[in-house]
């Protein structure tokens, strides 16, 4: 059961997993999306293009994810489990100007040892 | 501090091959995006090349291109410039510089730190 | 390519003084991908601003930057002995281009 607002789709959860989505500007063609549980990140993700339109992504911390042209969704297959946690991604623009970085609205995530059920309270 | 230093400048004769090299220090290499600038002693800058963060994406100035190759190894902390069949237009000082934004990206962004250049002559 | 064009080449102004230096792209500089770096003899290029009005890290709030579309301007508000250098305007968008530079000396 997730609670909070209807429409916010930031987190959604199947296979024992959570997605993560972190939505961001569709005119935004150079930026970093970090994902954090509360002060640690879990996931860094930064896209970058060159010349003729070539994408390349950097993916450190070698999370699952997917990236569509206004979203970055991170999966967390063991996500903590033993107390709530707050979720917030962060936004870095490079492209196009002016630079931007800017935390994005985060979510209070509570996984029941069962993960059958979870409760979600959102903090925007 | 951050420092770019380049090295392998000289005299060489039109025709010739000479390979750049900047060897970079006090910041995460792979964090950035990099150029080659070059610069006619008491004349303007010239963009030259660029590189993002692994290689994936490069480009060349319409002047260069099909001459010049761009490289880096992340594990030396260093980017190159093969320069081949060396003109005496190509006669310059060849600065490296870093992206502005740690984005990993050489395209669309401003270049912060530069190196203090390395001397190219082409002359017979 | 878009082609810079700084004016004016050289500006002979004393310390104190207000610089205004002007730069015109040939055809519009999309989403304001414009920069402004400053030299000194002997020295590497300094970013000044980017993003047409942006300024860099650790630069002084003397410097500002504005303009869009085709038309920027680098304004010093009150120049400092340090500032007499050579500025270049840069479009960053896609192929990187400098203007030719203006020399700012003192009178």
């Known amino acids: 059961e997730i609670n909070g607002s209807a429409d916010h789709r930031m987190f959604s959860f199947h296979n024992g997993g959570v997605q993560i989505s972190c939505k961001y500007p569709e005119t935004v063609q150079q930026l970093k999306m970090r994902l954090f549980r509360e002060r640690e990140v879990l996931c860094e993700l930064t896209k970058t293009k060159g010349s003729g339109n070539a994408v390349s992504i950097k993916n450190p911390m070698l999370c699952l994810y997917h990236l569509s042209n206004n979203s970055v969704s991170f999966f967390l297959n063991n996500p903590d489990s033993s107390q709530g946690s707050y979720y917030f991604c962060s936004l870095s623009i490079f492209d196009p100007p002016p630079f931007q970085e800017r935390n994005l609205s985060g979510g209070y995530l509570h996984i029941y040892e069962s993960q059958l059920c979870c409760q979600l309270k959102l903090w925007l | 501090e951050v420092q770019l230093v380049e090295s392998g400048g000289g005299v060489v004769r039109p025709g010739g091959s000479l390979r750049l090299s900047c060897a970079a220090s006090g910041l995460t290499f792979d964090d950035y995006g990099m150029s080659w600038v070059r610069q006619v002693p008491g004349k303007g800058l010239e963009w030259v090349s660029g590189?993002?963060?692994?290689?994936?994406?490069?480009d060349y100035a319409d002047s260069v291109k099909g001459r010049f190759t761009i490289s880096r190894d992340n594990a030396k902390n260093s980017l190159y410039l093969q320069m081949n069949s060396l003109r005496a237009e190509d006669t310059a000082l060849y600065y490296c510089?870093?992206?502005?934004?740690?984005?990993?990206?050489?395209?669309?962004?401003?270049?912060?730190?530069w190196g203090q250049g390395t001397l190219v002559t082409v002359s017979s | 390519e878009i082609v810079l064009t700084q004016s004016p080449g050289t500006l002979s102004l004393s310390p104190g003084e207000r610089a205004t230096l002007s730069c015109r792209a040939s055809q519009s500089v999309s989403s304001s991908y414009l920069a402004w770096y400053q030299q000194k003899p002997g020295q590497a290029p300094r970013l000044l601003i980017y993003?047409?009005?942006s300024r860099a890290t650790g630069i002084p709030d003397r410097f500002s930057g504005s303009g869009s579309g085709t038309d920027f301007t680098l304004t010093i508000r009150r120049l400092e002995p340090e500032d007499f250098a050579v500025y270049y305007c840069?479009?960053?968008?896609?192929?990187?281009?400098f203007g030719p530079g203006t020399k700012v000396d003192i009178k």
């Open positions: 993003g047409a009005s």
């Open positions: 840069q479009q960053y968008g896609s192929s990187p281009f």
């Open positions: 510089a870093r992206d502005y934004y740690g984005s990993g990206s050489y395209y669309n962004v401003p270049f912060d730190y």
């Open positions: 590189i993002n963060w692994n290689g994936d994406n490069t």
